[in-house]
Interface confidence: low
Amino acid sequence: VSITKCSSDMNGYCLHGQCIYLVDMSQNYCRCEVGYTGVRCEHFFL
């Protein structure tokens, strides 16, 4: 799967993680920091 950095328009989309753009799927995706989950890495879990 080809990935690249999200456009600047998506700044702030991922609350606790890095936004990556899945080129083949034309979708933005949040790569969450450790301890976070959710579409925007909005949920913390232990």
């Epitope: 328009d9 700044n11 702030g12 609350l15 959710g38 913390f44």
Partner: antibody, heavy 124, light 107 residues
Framework: HLQLQESGPGLVKSSETLSLTCSVS??????????WGWIRQPPGKGLEWIGS???????YYNPSLKSRVTISADTSKSQYSLKLSSVTAADTAVYYC????????????????WGNGTTVTVSS | DIQMTQSPSSLSASVGDSVTITCRAS??????LNWYQKKPGKAPKVLIY???SLQSGVPSRFSGSGSGTDFTLTISSLQPEDFATYYC?????????FGQGTRLEIK
């Protein structure tokens, strides 16, 4: 300076759709770094967030209202709108539009610019 | 959703007093907490964002503190224009929620 102004009918019949528009002057809703939202305050009650959108397409809604709410934008007119379907008396409130800034490093989403609010009454 | 609970619901104070309003989140929200002042017939006004950052143009007698689940808004040396209703608001998750409000009245 930036100003927001809500407009729409002050009276809506029960079971019908409430439609409001927020007109933005002195700025653009397609400016990078800002979300644009709707908040309401029922009589004698607290503030309730309805939903917000970012011009590039991200739109978020209050889960308790999600099935009835649509927020859309007309960037050419620098306006955005709220549609709330199947209204009841519980939807009677003052409705505000507001801007909330964000950036990559923080996501505090505090509403820094508000409209004056418009009162909507749902009648049976 | 994250529930925000403010206390007290109302309080009375005099001009010159110092008052503290508390906001508690139902789960940890780091410092994703904002405070607003609301007067009847007027739009809310942001006072504090990120738990402790003073919004531009807001008098320094307003201050915020806290992290995790417990937060406070302190108003030192109350002025006549400070009597209003105050709301906390979290933005830790996509679904923004407000506290129920604290009404500050003149004693």
């Amino acid at each position: 300076h930036l100003q927001l102004q809500e407009s729409g009918p002050g009276l809506v019949k029960s079971s019908e759709t409430l439609s409001l528009t927020c007109s933005v002057s002195g700025g653009s809703i397609s400016s990078s770094g800002y979300y644009w939202g709707w908040i309401r305050q029922p009589p004698g009650k607290g503030l309730e967030w309805i939903g917000s959108f970012y011009y590039s397409g991200n739109t978020y809604y209050n889960p308790s209202l999600k099935s009835r709410v649509t927020i859309s934008a007309d960037t050419s007119k620098s306006q955005y709108s709220l549609k709330l379907s199947s209204v009841t008396a519980a939807d009677t409130a003052v409705y505000y539009c507001a801007r909330h800034p964000f950036n990559w490093n923080d996501h505090y989403h505090y509403m820094d610019v508000w409209g004056n609010g418009t009162t909507v009454t749902v009648s049976s | 959703d994250i529930q925000m609970t403010q206390s007290p619901s109302s309080l009375s104070a005099s001009v010159g007093d110092s008052v503290t309003i508390t906001c508690r989140a139902s789960q940890s929200i780091s410092n994703y907490l904002n405070w607003y002042q609301k007067k009847p017939g007027k739009a809310p006004k942001v006072l504090i964002y990120a738990a402790s950052s003073l919004q531009s143009g807001v008098p320094s007698r307003f201050s915020g503190s806290g992290s995790g689940t417990d937060f406070t808004l302190t108003i030192s040396s109350l002025q006549p224009e400070d009597f209003a209703t105050y709301y906390c608001q979290q933005s830790y998750i996509t679904s923004i929620t407000f506290g129920q409000g604290t009404r500050l009245e003149i004693k």
